[in-house]
């Protein structure tokens, strides 16, 4: 039975050229995390595997840094980075948990962080 919840940074905005941390946190479960996938719509950005460590897509390696923790740091943001991001937690024995983050990259300096929220 899956009892955990994924808490994410929610809907966030950031300035063009800046950086942002995409963060998910799995709580309310003692399940062991075996792998975390970070995906952007149809692309795999990065994987953190408990045994094999971090692997970043070559398409993003100049702008994506692993961490902090199981999160992902996006740098040198462009307007094209706007969109949905997913953290997919593979766990034992629970199974798979998915969190969603929407990032909006703004041209102006009006970027504000959205509130944190939970996805059951």
């Amino acid at each position: 039975m899956m009892t955990g919840t994924i808490e994410t940074t929610g809907n966030i905005s950031a300035e063009k050229g800046g950086s942002i941390i995409l963060q998910c946190h799995l709580s309310s479960t003692t399940a062991q995390v075996t792998q975390v996938n970070w995906e952007q719509q149809d692309q795999l950005l990065a994987i953190c595997n408990a045994d094999l460590g971090w692997h970043i897509s070559p398409s993003f390696k100049d702008r994506v840094a692993p961490g902090p923790g199981l999160g992902l740091t996006l740098q040198s943001l462009t307007v094209n980075d706007t969109g949905e991001y997913f953290c997919i937690y593979h766990t034992y024995p629970d199974g798979t948990y998915t969190g969603r983050i929407f990032l909006e990259v703004l041209e102006s300096s009006v970027a504000e962080h959205g509130a944190r929220f939970q996805i059951p």
Epitope: Q32, T34, Q35, N37, E39, D42, Q43, L44, I47, N49, A50, D51, L52, H55, I88, H90, T91, Y92, P93, G95, T96
Partner: nanobody, 117 residues
Framework: EVQLVESGGGLVQAGGSLRLSCAAS????????SMWWFRQAPGKEREFLA????????LYADSVKGRFTISADNAKNTVYLQMNSLKPEDTAVYYC??????????WGQGTQVTVSS
Amino acid sequence: EVQLVESGGGLVQAGGSLRLSCAASGRTFSTYASMWWFRQAPGKEREFLAIITDGSKTLYADSVKGRFTISADNAKNTVYLQMNSLKPEDTAVYYCAGSWSYPGLTWGQGTQVTVSS
């Protein structure tokens, strides 16, 4: 317990192609979290090549991007590595590894690929 068996290696001339297979047995294949290909050349460290996730998303190492393609056939419980435009420096033992949603990895025994110039 899962077992992975690689096949398809061999001797090929530079510029040629090979398709490696990694067949899984002993567990429902479609429940994997990710399948990986690595290689190890004599006297060198193991090198990551490619990943395919359970959602069929892929990620490649710089050294093989555009030349190698990873794919999976869940019905056949098999992951493939299509290798094109092979170079002598691709000579190595190629390994697949599987990560399921339980602790630990499963490794295959490896298959030798030799690219002659």
